[in-house]
Amino acid sequence: PPRGRILGGREAEAHARPYMASVQLNGAHLCGGVLVAEQWVLSAAHCLEDAADGKVQVLLGAHSLSQPEPSKRLYDVLRAVPHPDSQPDTIDHDLLLLQLSEKATLGPAVRPLPWQRVDRDVAPGTLCDVAGWGIVNHAGRRPDSLQHVLLPVLDRATCNRRTHHDGAITERLMCAESNRRDSCKGDSGGPLVCGGVLEGVVTSGSRVCGNRKKPGIYTRVASYAAWIDSVLA
């Protein structure tokens, strides 16, 4: 099943997030992703855990997953590079870089997103945008078109409380509020964008969605700048 969900959001303006990618397995949406360079998409390492024998591709320039759109194009993956420290049973280092088979054709609907290189926390309360094609309600309805939601950043000390994430949130992770509006598993790998800059990537660990005591967890890209640069080099 797709790893993803935007709860309590709304349909995004078509092609207004030209960095948005759908990571696909055997032709079906699996995870979100974000175009960070002409030939590279950043996603979550856990997304490919169950994809050993399947064909992984990346869809760029899409709003609708099913309808024909002039800007849509499906790219094969030349190389998948999970973070070397990512492990199946933890949320730490949950990053994946996918090298496309060729450079993406850039245009108004396909454009890399600048990512944060300054390793400094986003201030709590800052509204950030998360988008994805994950299911939109607890009944499991999957959207055809891209959804998004604005979420306030939550401070790490609150996020680490016993009834929240009980000490699991390291300096390399950040949290966003989850009170009925939330990202969830199927949005894994998708972007958390604050002030027009990529700050986080949705982690793909198992988590209750839409419960305010279980905030969304995002991998802070600034904390992995050296690794991202080394792979893209």
């Epitope: 016993r162 009834t163 390291t170």
Partner: antibody, heavy 116, light 112 residues
């Protein structure tokens, strides 16, 4: 390794003020809230509240509103508990306890004795 | 506040015995997220409490498998399969599901 080191024992008179410190090391201080727990002589444990080490916002249990104040010196990775207008019933050992996982990390405790 | 009632308050044992401590909460302590934040702590004389068990039955790192926790709803139990000298002290149950978080009064595990 993670350590919480508290200040030494205090002998105070009723009506005075005491300020206990709790210095954290081995982790990033602002990422985990700090709780305070009271243990009267020969008694059980009572949660007093916690302070958000990221925002500085304190939360007090009902029995500890008024004379009790939690504060921080983030640059020194230190949390403080201040008790004003001390009463005999404040005689106890006070523990600082880090949030997450559970209450796995405790200070060694600070004994405050209030006696005329 | 959620009242945590422990029984017995004192438990004399011989080394090698099995020991069982009961804890009853005045309210169901299952949290809205489906977890039950019931923990057990051991405090030895002159020391700080140490976390043994979290979320009813999960042993904290380094805790021997002689310790086991069980229960649900309002009734919880800590069992020590073979008591060793190092296990003596006061055991506290604790609920972290409802604010204010609360401890039981403690059970003193002592030698007969």
């Amino acid at each position: 390794q993670i350590q919480l080191v508290q200040s030494g024992p205090e002998l105070k008179k009723p009506g005075e003020t005491v300020k206990i410190s709790c210095k954290a090391s081995g982790y990033i201080f602002r990422n985990y809230g700090m709780n305070w727990v009271k243990q009267g002589p020969g008694k059980g444990l009572k949660w007093m509240g916690w302070i958000n080490t990221y925002t500085g916002e304190p939360t007090y249990a009902d029995d500890f509103k008024g004379r009790f104040a939690f504060s921080l010196e983030t640059s020194a990775s230190t949390a403080y508990l201040q008790i004003s207008n001390l009463k005999n019933e404040d005689t106890a050992t006070y523990f600082c306890v880090r949030d997450g996982p559970g209450f796995a990390y405790w200070g060694q405790g600070t004994l405050v004795t209030v006696s005329a | 506040d959620v009242l945590m009632t422990q029984t017995p308050l004192s438990l004399p044992v011989s080394l090698g015995d099995q020991a069982s401590i009961s804890c009853r909460s005045s309210l169901i302590i299952e949290h809205s997220d489906g977890n039950t934040y019931l923990e057990w702590y051991l405090q030895k004389p002159g020391q700080s409490p140490k976390l043994l068990i979290y979320k009813v039955s999960n042993r904290f790192s380094g805790v021997p498998d002689r310790f086991s926790g069980s229960g649900s709803g309002t009734d919880f139990t800590l069992k020590i399969s073979r008591v060793e000298a190092d296990d003596l002290g006061v055991y506290y149950c604790f609920q972290g599901s409802h604010v204010p978080v609360t401890f039981g009064a403690g059970t003193n595990l002592e030698l007969k």
